[in-house]
């Protein structure tokens, strides 16, 4: 007889991301004896929560928790049996969640204990849900996208542990509700609220984080048609030949338009309002969302916080990967520059809406807003965040890395389950020939 | 309160040309709305078949795109539908309706609900020699 | 294009009962957190009239025993408390893609 070496046994962990748009289960894996190997942790399968996030059920809590039965149900056929009580659930909530926290803390709460309910009813070992700071995304984003990417430590041929040349990548995302930047700095911020400190692997790490709320893509986009309604009889960033009927109460109801809302205003009253194709004013009203006139620091982004200047290579992914794959697959636009990502904003900003419709087949009302979007992104970047063309050169966008989506979920996980070690490991185990 | 109402021959030779028009009262199709046709099969469900905006931009369903065309007369507040080329398979009953996108909110994000809200009455078409 | 399948084709229900009818579409209809199904009554001899959008939106002037549910590819219109003049053939219509398709509707007859 001889001995049948056994595969060896695989740890599991679940993450449901609870966004302002909708909800994703992630469930990862790896295995058990390279528990503190990098990049080894990667994403064994995903879940879409149908419906929206769990915001939205703010006047029904228990349908939030109902809403998730679906992907847990997948959840309990994607790990094995034996793994369910070993293998950790948890629930992190974005922006979506800190709005309504804002608004409606008591329908917070209710949503959060109707969630808990739920996941609690599961086999897994349920370690929470809450509601993380936007600190906590943009730095669990980082370190996901810096894991996945093995920046932090590399396995050497000797047997030890080294730390590669090559440094973090920074990252940014745009979500529904909100937008984080973070990245590596070697200078100390002059904002103690913007700097993180991290020890991994045995190397320190100073990183930058910013979250700015109500800079989400879908915020955004409510928040130019509050503008639009106040400043205009048309929106210049929907296209030409596009109309809608809005609900005033639907504009105004979010905690993000309250500077556009007027002091007295019907909310059930429905109001029409056209495209009219124009990239220069919708450029200005795009603008009038980002402020400059004040900074308390040596220099900032906007909206008078502090940033350092932008350094080293970077990832964009959420919604700043799906809008420059719009301009790059959808309309085969250019945008390796940053002159070519403000062309290709102007671009479909100039499309009609049945000039659309012919370039993107079979989608519907969702490309209406692709020229905002575009347009949002291009300013974000180079005037928020001042990104110049050499530096926008150092960014790529991309939603997956190693096969693993790339957001703050993996980075949350890895934490919580003490899965980066603070110290490097040891010797690599093995036999000793000396 | 938008008002439209079709008319036409109710019937047609194969081969020919379909013609119908709709009139709108109470709103001029230049303003907004987009101005559908929707037929009705006997016995059957409901099938799109194109529609002429405020704009006078057309978007048509692919499957009948060859043979149709919406145009409008703004003088006279009316749309009209041609289809060429008739069968006994296009024998239904031809509604004209005003559609618009909705704007809508849920979970914080909003979107476009395309809802055609306000119909004809519908006018019957047989296709026969 | 999306192809909308109703069932049942006829139900029957006595005044007072709830009305359950199903709209299964061939591929999702949700984008980004959104249902993109309307749903429309078509009573003998008239119109089509819109009942809900976006799946679960009661348009006005509809009365509350009507609801809607479901996002993805299964959808449900339930109308709690039947009335005999809800007798009328039921439509689901789907505009997340082009061209917009509509079911191929479900008859409510009343006992």
């Known amino acids: 007889t001889r001995d049948i070496r056994e595969p060896p046994a695989l740890k599991y962990g679940i993450v449901l991301d609870a966004g302002s748009s909708h909800t994703s289960m992630f469930i990862y894996k790896w295995p058990a004896d390279k528990e503190n190997d990098t990049g080894i942790v990667g994403q064994h399968s995903s879940c879409d929560v149908p419906g929206g996030g769990i915001s939205s059920y703010a006047d029904n809590p228990s349908g939030a928790g109902q809403s998730l039965v679906g992907c847990l149900e997948q959840a309990l056929r994607d790990v094995p049996k034996e793994r369910h009580a070993g293998t950790p659930l948890y629930l992190g909530a974005t922006a979506g969640m800190r709005l309504l926290n804002l608004t409606n803390p008591e329908a917070s709460t209710s949503v959060l204990t109707a969630v808990t309910h739920t996941l609690t009813q599961y086999p897994f070992d349920f370690r929470g849900a809450r509601i993380l700071s936007g600190q906590e995304e943009g730095v669990f984003g980082w370190v996901t996208a810096n894991y996945l990417l093995e920046n932090f430590i590399k396995y050497g041929w000797v047997g030890r542990w080294f730390r590669p040349r090559k440094g973090t990548l920074g990252a940014m995302d745009l979500g529904g509700a909100s937008t984080q930047i973070t990245f590596e700095t070697t200078s100390p911020a002059e904002d103690r609220a913007s700097e993180v400190q991290l020890r991994l692997y045995g190397q320190h790490y100073r990183v930058y984080t910013h979250s700015f709320l109500c800079y989400g893509r879908d915020q955004v986009l409510q928040r130019l048609l509050a503008s639009a309604l106040q400043t205009h009889s048309f929106h210049p960033c929907w296209p030409r030949g596009f109309s809608t009927h809005v609900l005033l109460g639907d504009v105004y109801q979010s905690p993000c338009t309250v500077a556009q809302r007027p002091q007295t205003f019907n909310s059930s009253a429905r109001v029409s309002l056209s495209g009219s194709s124009d990239p220069h004013l919708c450029r200005d009203l795009v603008s009038g969302l980002f402020s400059f006139s004040s900074c308390p620091f040596s220099r900032c982004s906007f909206n008078g916080v502090f940033q350092p200047p932008v350094a080293g290579n970077f990832i964009a992914f959420s919604a700043f990967f799906y809008t420059v794959n719009f301009l790059r697959t959808s309309m085969g636009l250019p945008v390796a520059t940053l002159q070519q990502l403000e062309a290709a904003a102007v671009n479909v900003c100039n499309q009609t809406w049945a000039q659309l419709q012919a370039r993107v087949p079979g989608q519907q009302a969702h490309l209406a807003d692709y020229c905002a979007g575009a347009m949002f992104v291009q300013q974000l970047l180079s005037r928020g965040y001042g990104f110049d063309e050499r530096a926008f050169g150092g960014v790529i966008f991309q939603k997956k890395a190693a096969d693993t989506a790339v957001g703050w979920a993996l980075g949350y996980m890895l934490n919580l389950t003490n899965l980066i070690p603070a110290d490097p490991p040891g010797l690599r185990k093995g036999t000793d020939f000396s | 309160q938008i008002q439209l109402q079709e008319s036409g021959p109710g019937l047609v030779k194969p081969s020919q040309t379909l013609s119908l028009t709709c009139t709108v009262s109470?709103?001029?199709?230049?303003?907004?709305?987009?101005w559908n046709w929707i037929r009705q099969h006997p016995g059957k469900g409901l099938e799109w078949i194109g529609y002429?905006?405020?704009?006078?931009?057309?978007n048509y369903n692919p499957s009948l795109k060859n043979r149709v065309t919406i145009s409008r007369d703004t003088s006279k507040n009316q749309f009209s539908l041609k289809l060429s080329s008739v069968t006994a398979a296009d024998t239904a009953v031809y509604y004209c309706?005003?559609?618009?996108?909705?704007?809508?909110?849920?979970?914080?994000?909003?979107?476009?609900?395309?809802?055609?809200?306000?119909w004809g009455q519908g006018t019957t078409v047989t296709v026969s020699s | 294009e999306t192809v909308l399948t109703q069932s049942p084709a006829t139900l029957s229900v006595s005044p007072g009962e709830r009305a359950t009818i199903s709209c299964k579409a061939s591929q999702s209809v949700d984008y980004e957190g959104h249902s993109y199904m309307n749903w429309y009554q078509q009573k003998p001899g008239q119109a089509p009239r819109l009942l809900i959008y976006a799946a679960s939106n009661l348009e006005s002037g509809i009365p509350a025993r009507f609801s809607g549910s479901g996002s993805g590819t299964d959808f449900t219109l339930t109308i709690s408390s039947v009335e005999p003049e809800d007798a009328a053939t039921y439509y689901c219509q789907q505009s997340n893609e082009d061209p917009p398709t509509f079911g191929g509707g479900t008859k409510l007859e009343i006992k």
């Open positions: 002429i905006s405020y704009d006078a931009d057309n």
């Open positions: 309706a005003g559609g618009y996108y909705r704007y809508g909110l849920g979970s914080y994000r909003g979107s476009y609900y395309y809802v055609m809200d306000y």
């Open positions: 109470g709103y001029s199709i230049t303003s907004g709305y987009y």
